[in-house]
Interface confidence: medium
């Protein structure tokens, strides 16, 4: 009889990484599908994604830039990660047998942890990483911009396919690691000032800096996070005009 | 506050290998996935992989499968690249960064520079 | 992404009666012949249970008085008679192989008279 057993921390703050593992007795791993599926207290069923022992991965679009999952067949084991939690996270959490590639049915089920979100405990996390796909192409524009200070700039983006919001913009000074300006397309990071702003969805995205200070003048990358692995764009810089 | 403090520069002869390292503070390093990123002299970026260093778990960009080895030491909160058969391409400064919510990159490591000459 | 409307919300059932749930799909989950519906029940504390896999078989050791049938868009769950046992929340659920996405419908609570 084939039996899954949910392992994981109870209490986990939010911005945590969850990591949760299901060891599975009785059978092998080996061959079958094997997914997470959540349940917040009172609602219903939500499916998180699944594995194949192979490693190849399909996740949930809602989740899918939050959601890692890994298996190792020499433990019998497979693992979720879910990263940036919320208190929207808090749910019970399964692990399930996902019978075979057509039917998509559930046979087998862990009994079941309880995970939940909440600043009592637990330490401080971060992002997960997306699904599988094809490498998502960029065109960036232009290479080079001059402008003066005051003026007001727009570098586009385009993507070879639909990414939805998942795309962030970074500058970079000479010799500087770049910064994060913009997450999920139009979220101005904390400490960013207002003048910076983004749009845009699906495959065309844009970064606007409204009125240019001195200390704009920098090199612009866009970044895909829709698709594994991520990629940058090829870079805009701008430049005093002179 | 969150902080990384990466490895003075290298110099390598074709062929070698090196061990880039990254410390981290001001957060709890297990919870986070650090990310290594490339950016050669006058180029853009390019993402390398990232490690869970709650577990070790190593993702890879297809081009740096068997170039680059990511590690992490838990109780010294250092993330290690290892970049192996080095060639005069790998010439590049290297990026650690750390990846928060949405996938997006929040903090990055100084860089180190990697100069690979005969 | 197939949206899953169960109705209804909840029923109250008396015991040896005939209990009916309803799923209806956004749009139509048959493919390569079948019909990827499938229904598990849930009793608090305890994980669902499958109980029919695609639309109408019923799983091993489940009771024959559980039975689904339905294609395309339209599915239904029946208990007939209905059991003490029986009161829990019912799901449907289906498989729709592109976009790699599966949906749960939001449940039926059944309770028995």
């Known amino acids: 009889q084939v039996q899954l057993q949910e392992s994981g921390p109870g209490l986990v703050k939010p911005s945590e990484t969850l990591s949760l593992t299901c060891t599975v007795s009785g059978g092998s791993i080996s061959n079958y599908y094997w997914s997470w599926i959540r349940q917040p207290a009172g609602k219903g069923l939500e499916w998180i994604g699944r594995i194949y022992t192979s490693g190849s991965t399909n996740y949930n679009p809602s989740l899918k830039s939050r959601v890692t999952m890994s298996v190792d067949t020499s433990k019998n084991q497979f693992s979720l990660k879910l990263s940036s939690l919320t208190a929207a996270d808090t749910a019970i959490y399964y692990c399930a047998r996902y019978y075979d590639i057509l039917t998509g049915f559930f046979d087998y089920w862990g009994q079941g942890t309880l995970v939940t979100v909440s600043s009592g405990g637990g330490g401080s996390g971060g992002g997960g990483s997306g699904g599988g796909g094809s490498v998502i192409w960029m065109t960036q524009s232009p290479s080079l911009l001059s402008a003066s200070t005051g003026d007001s700039v727009t570098i586009s983006c385009r993507m070879s396919q639909d990414i939805s919001s998942y795309l962030a913009w970074y500058q970079q000074k000479p010799g500087k690691a770049p910064e994060l300006l913009i997450y999920a397309a139009s979220s101005l990071q904390s400490g960013v000032p207002s003048r910076f702003s983004g749009s845009g969805s699906g495959t065309d995205f844009t970064l606007t800096i409204s009125s240019l200070q001195s200390e704009d003048f920098a090199t612009y990358y866009c970044q895909q996070y829709d698709s594994f692995p991520p990629t940058f764009g090829q870079g805009t810089k701008v430049e005093f005009k002179r | 506050q969150v902080q990384f403090q990466q490895s003075g520069a290298e110099l390598a002869r074709p062929g070698a290998s090196v061990k880039l390292s990254c410390k981290a503070s001001g957060y709890t390093f297990t919870s986070y996935w650090m990310q290594w990123v490339k950016q050669r002299p006058g180029q853009g970026l390019e993402w390398i992989g990232t490690?869970?260093?709650?577990?070790?778990?190593?993702r890879y960009s297809q081009k740096f499968k068997g170039k680059a080895t990511l590690t992490a030491d838990k109780s010294s909160s250092t993330a290690y690249m290892q970049l192996s058969s080095l060639a005069s391409e790998d010439s590049a400064v290297y990026y650690c960064?750390?990846?928060?919510?949405?996938?997006?990159?929040?903090?990055w490591g100084q860089g180190t520079s990697v100069t690979v000459s005969s | 992404n197939i949206v899953l409307t169960q109705s209804p919300a909840s029923l109250a059932v008396s015991l040896g009666q005939r209990a009916t749930i309803s799923c209806r799909a956004s749009e139509s989950v048959d493919s390569y012949g079948s019909s990827f519906m499938h229904w598990y029940q849930e009793k608090p504390g305890q994980p669902p249970k499958l109980l029919i896999f695609l639309a109408s078989n019923l799983e091993s050791g489940v009771p024959a008085r559980f039975s689904g049938s339905g294609s395309r868009t339209d599915f239904t769950l029946t208990i007939d008679p209905v059991e003490a046992d029986d009161a829990a929340t019912y799901y449907c659920?289906?498989?729709?192989?592109?976009?790699?996405?599966?949906?749960f419908g939001g449940g039926t609570k059944l309770e028995i008279r």
């Open positions: 659920q289906q498989n729709n192989e592109d976009p790699n996405m599966y949906t």
């Open positions: 960064t750390r990846r928060r919510g949405y996938d997006a990159m929040d903090y």
């Open positions: 490690i869970y260093p709650g577990d070790g778990d190593a």
